[in-house]
């Protein structure tokens, strides 16, 4: 593997690790092969501190981040124990809500207007922030 | 100046493999990803497959997935394509191209001359 | 996958005309847009990125504009140089597709 000492040009870098914040939209999927192919994965939040960092220069615009549930309970990307981790929850989030209209549930989570995590349909468009750490060797990704 | 060099192109039967590089210079090559793309004769571009820069996460068209394998060595600034399985709809020049820094997206900026592909036999 | 529409697929012009190439996608793919110059035996050259952004080196008669799905490649005044094939390329998604392609030739 090889090893980053400093943040790539247009990352920032916050607490030893390296955040890209996209201008655009994708998909979950989508915003999730970008994150690996910069050799990283899509945001894992552990803490209030980290979640303020984010939502700081996210802004009060849909996000996506590394949690999931597609198969069956919610995980993050990098394989952070959901169970016992830090959450931010909506209140009523997650709800798997069918009513969209677009066929499933909501099992892609994402930050909303005002910080706080929604479960919603993966394939919305929405931004999303990619994050790795300094000082570790580059691991191959967990499947999903 | 930045430069890529592909070679390893050549004749080869249908079913068999081939092993293409692309040199690359004028740059850090271990800060970027890197791509192939083909073009038929007389046709157009088709994308093949890209790598991140470490190497470890790769992508590819549906078209070559399970037959092509992209790596790298960052060592000797090189990045491969393995050709196996090789089919007449294979046969192309095989272009590496430079994964651009652009702000989300899989651009390429940077391209060789490529190397061409003859499926026949 | 994202299919490009590239059109017009050949198209004759005279030295000083302004061309036009257009090329529209399948789905909204925000300003992820190459243009490309290819000569006959050459790889191709960027010469657009970013939908409207001009490559460093790139004369400034070639001008890139559009967002979304519908995209336009413009030359002001052709040169005999320009003779060659336009490509344009979405990158926002995998797999990266390109339009068909714009051959350009001189009347």
């Known amino acids: 593997g090889s090893e980053r000492t400093c943040c790539p040009v247009n990352w920032v870098e916050h607490e030893r690790s390296c955040y890209w914040f996209s201008r655009s939209g994708k998909a979950w999927a989508d915003a999730d092969n970008y994150c690996r192919l910069e050799d990283a994965h899509l945001v894992v939040v552990t803490s209030w501190e980290e979640q303020k960092f984010v939502q700081h220069h996210i802004g009060p615009v849909n996000t996506w981040m590394g949690l999931h549930d597609q198969n069956g309970p919610w995980k993050w990307v990098d394989g952070t124990d959901y169970e016992t981790g830090f959450k931010n929850w909506r209140p009523e989030q997650p709800d798997d809500w069918y009513g969209h209209g677009l066929g499933g549930g909501e099992d892609c989570a994402h930050f909303t207007d005002d910080g706080r995590w929604n479960d919603d349909v993966c394939q919305r468009p929405y931004r999303w922030v990619c994050e790795t750490e300094l000082d570790k060797a580059s691991q191959e990704p967990p499947l999903l | 100046q930045v430069q890529l060099v592909e070679s390893g192109g050549g004749v080869v039967q249908p079913g068999r493999s081939l092993r293409l590089s692309c040199a690359a210079s004028?740059?850090?090559?271990?800060?970027?990803?890197m791509h192939w793309v083909r073009q038929a004769p007389g046709k157009g571009l088709e994308w093949v497959a890209v790598i991140s820069y470490s190497g470890n996460n790769k992508y590819y068209a549906d078209s070559v997935k399970g037959r092509f394998t992209i790596s790298r060595d960052n060592s000797k600034n090189t990045l491969y394509l393995q050709l196996n399985s090789l089919r007449a709809e294979d046969m192309a020049v095989y272009y590496c191209?430079?994964?651009?820094?652009?702000?989300?997206?899989?651009?390429?900026?940077?391209w060789g001359h490529g190397t061409t592909v003859t499926v026949s036999s | 996958d994202i299919q490009m529409t590239q059109s017009p697929s050949s198209l004759s012009a005279s030295v000083g005309d302004r061309v036009t190439i257009t090329c529209q996608a399948s789905q909204d793919i925000s300003d992820y847009l190459n243009w490309y110059q290819q000569k006959p035996g050459k790889a191709p050259k960027l010469l657009i990125y970013?939908?409207?952004t001009l490559e460093t080196g790139v004369p400034s008669r070639f001008s890139g504009s559009g967002s979304g799905t519908d995209f336009t490649f413009t030359i002001s005044s052709l040169q005999p140089e320009d003779i060659a094939t336009y490509f344009c390329q979405q990158y926002d998604n995998l797999p990266i597709t390109f339009g068909q392609g714009t051959r350009l030739e001189i009347k």
């Open positions: 004028g740059f850090t090559f271990s800060n970027y990803g």
């Open positions: 191209a430079r994964r651009s820094s652009s702000w989300g997206g899989y651009g390429m900026d940077v």
């Open positions: 970013d939908a409207s």
